[in-house]
């Protein structure tokens, strides 16, 4: 009997109710390999998901995220809300980066500005919520009489990051 089932190709299942006959997978289901005793359930791309690839009798559907959201994971198992640059997503929605932190993308968390002084350098361009500071030459490298750039503010902990 097992041999009969192994003959069932992808897109079918081995139907025990019908004497091991290979039956096509019902609507909204699929089997990606031969010899299956049950068909898998097709994924539905609804809500914040949109269909990238329709389900077939031999392969599952693939989803993308609708505008304003981005995929998490290579298989787009979840959609996460986009935020603006200078923000991060928290449990309560998009929040501006705390002073001393920045985010130059629509996703991810706010990260502390670079501490130029750790590399013995000075701040050439101040940081913003959207951009990191730009470090310049060390104060010692500046010619006498040259004005020193404003030192960086102490970095604070970034806001709560989504799980």
């Amino acid at each position: 009997l097992q041999d009969l089932c192994s003959n069932c190709p992808a897109g079918t299942f081995c139907d025990n109710n019908r004497s091991q006959i290979c039956s096509p997978c019902p609507p909204n289901s699929f089997s990606s390999a031969g010899g299956q005793r049950t068909c898998d359930i097709c994924r539905q791309c609804k809500g914040v998901f949109k269909t990238r690839k329709e389900c077939s009798s031999t392969s599952n559907a693939e989803c993308d995220c609708i505008s304003g959201y981005h995929c998490l994971g290579a298989e787009c198992s979840m959609c996460e809300q986009d935020c603006k640059q200078g923000q991060e997503l928290t449990k309560k929605g998009c929040k501006d980066c705390c002073f001393g932190t920045f985010n130059d993308q629509k996703r991810g968390i706010c990260r502390p500005w670079t501490n130029c002084s750790l590399d013995g350098k000075s701040v050439l361009v101040n940081g913003t919520k959207e951009r990191d500071v730009v470090c310049g030459p060390s104060p010692a490298d500046l010619s006498p009489g040259a004005s020193s750039a404003t030192p960086p503010a102490p970095a604070r902990e970034p806001g709560h990051s989504p799980q």
């Epitope: 898998d40 599952n60 989504p162």
Partner: antibody
Framework: QSLEEAGGDLVKPGASLTLTCTAS?????????MCWVRQAPGKGLEWIAC????????TYYANWAKGRFTISKTSSTTVTLQMTSLTAADTATYFC????????????WGQGTLVTVSS | ALVMTQTPASVSAAVGGTVTINCQAS??????LAWYQQKPGQPPKLLIF???DLASGVPSRFSGSGSGTQFTLTISGVQCDDAATYYC??????????????FGGGTEVVVK
């Protein structure tokens, strides 16, 4: 394709236990939600946790299970459920189940493994 | 948390008759509902998915309907082999901190 649970045992209250679910005839290279469901003797089904076997590895827990139960993918064919601080209320048959839909619909189940918590 | 309320708790039917089981979700779950059959000493078996789609190998006398918060499983032309406990299950994956998934309490079907 089949699932087999192992690790069920008679343990004392307060003990910890790890259950294993082993997949045969398929692997997690195809992305699934692998889940644990339990059933106390003579009672109904109770969902515990799921893990997405794809790259994100996302985990999902029933509110009551958070903190005491931990689901993990330990290989391309095994998923575990770690349980701590067990009480008599955790006495149940624990089933492993597979979902390809993303919506808590399990088309493949193991036979279950019995966990008994008693002093 | 999502709560699934299933009625009745028990129902009796004659062979050839019809059984209707209801399931109510505490919030809108679209069509993300499954029905299972479980016999003593066995794991549950998927019957219906997405509220109305028949799972592979399930006889056509089983049918499901509904959307949102109200769902129904119907067994038409009940057979002796249909004596079992039936469960509805609803839910969907949102995020790790807000997950919704639950089973109904079950309905025992007795065939006379």
């Amino acid at each position: 394709q089949s699932l087999e649970e192992a690790g069920g045992d008679l343990v004392k209250p307060g003990a910890s236990l790890t259950l294993t679910c082993t997949a045969s005839g398929f692997s997690f290279t195809s992305s699934y939600y692998m889940c644990w469901v339990r059933q106390a003797p003579g009672k109904g089904l109770e969902w515990i946790a799921c893990i997405y076997t794809g790259s994100s590895g996302s985990t999902y827990y029933a509110n009551w299970a958070k903190g005491r139960f931990t689901i993990s993918k330990t290989s391309s064919t095994t998923v575990t459920l770690q349980m701590t601080s067990l009480t008599a209320a955790d006495t149940a048959t624990y089933f492993c189940a597979r979902d390809s839909s993303s919506y808590y619909m399990f088309n493949l189940w193991g036979q279950g493994t019995l966990v008994t918590v008693s002093s | 948390a999502l709560v699934m309320t299933q009625t009745p708790a028990s129902v009796s039917a004659a062979v050839g008759g019809t059984v209707t089981i209801n399931c109510q979700a505490s919030e809108d779950i679209d069509n993300y509902l499954a029905w299972y059959q479980q016999k003593p000493g066995q794991p549950p078996k998927l019957l219906i998915f997405y509220a109305s789609d028949l799972a592979s190998g399930v006889p056509s006398r089983f049918s499901g309907s509904g959307s949102g918060t109200q769902f129904t499983l119907t067994i038409s032309g009940v057979q002796c082999d249909d004596a079992a406990t039936y469960y509805c299950q609803g839910g969907y994956y949102t995020s790790s901190t807000d997950t919704r998934g639950a089973f109904g309490g079950g309905t025992e079907v007795v065939v006379k």
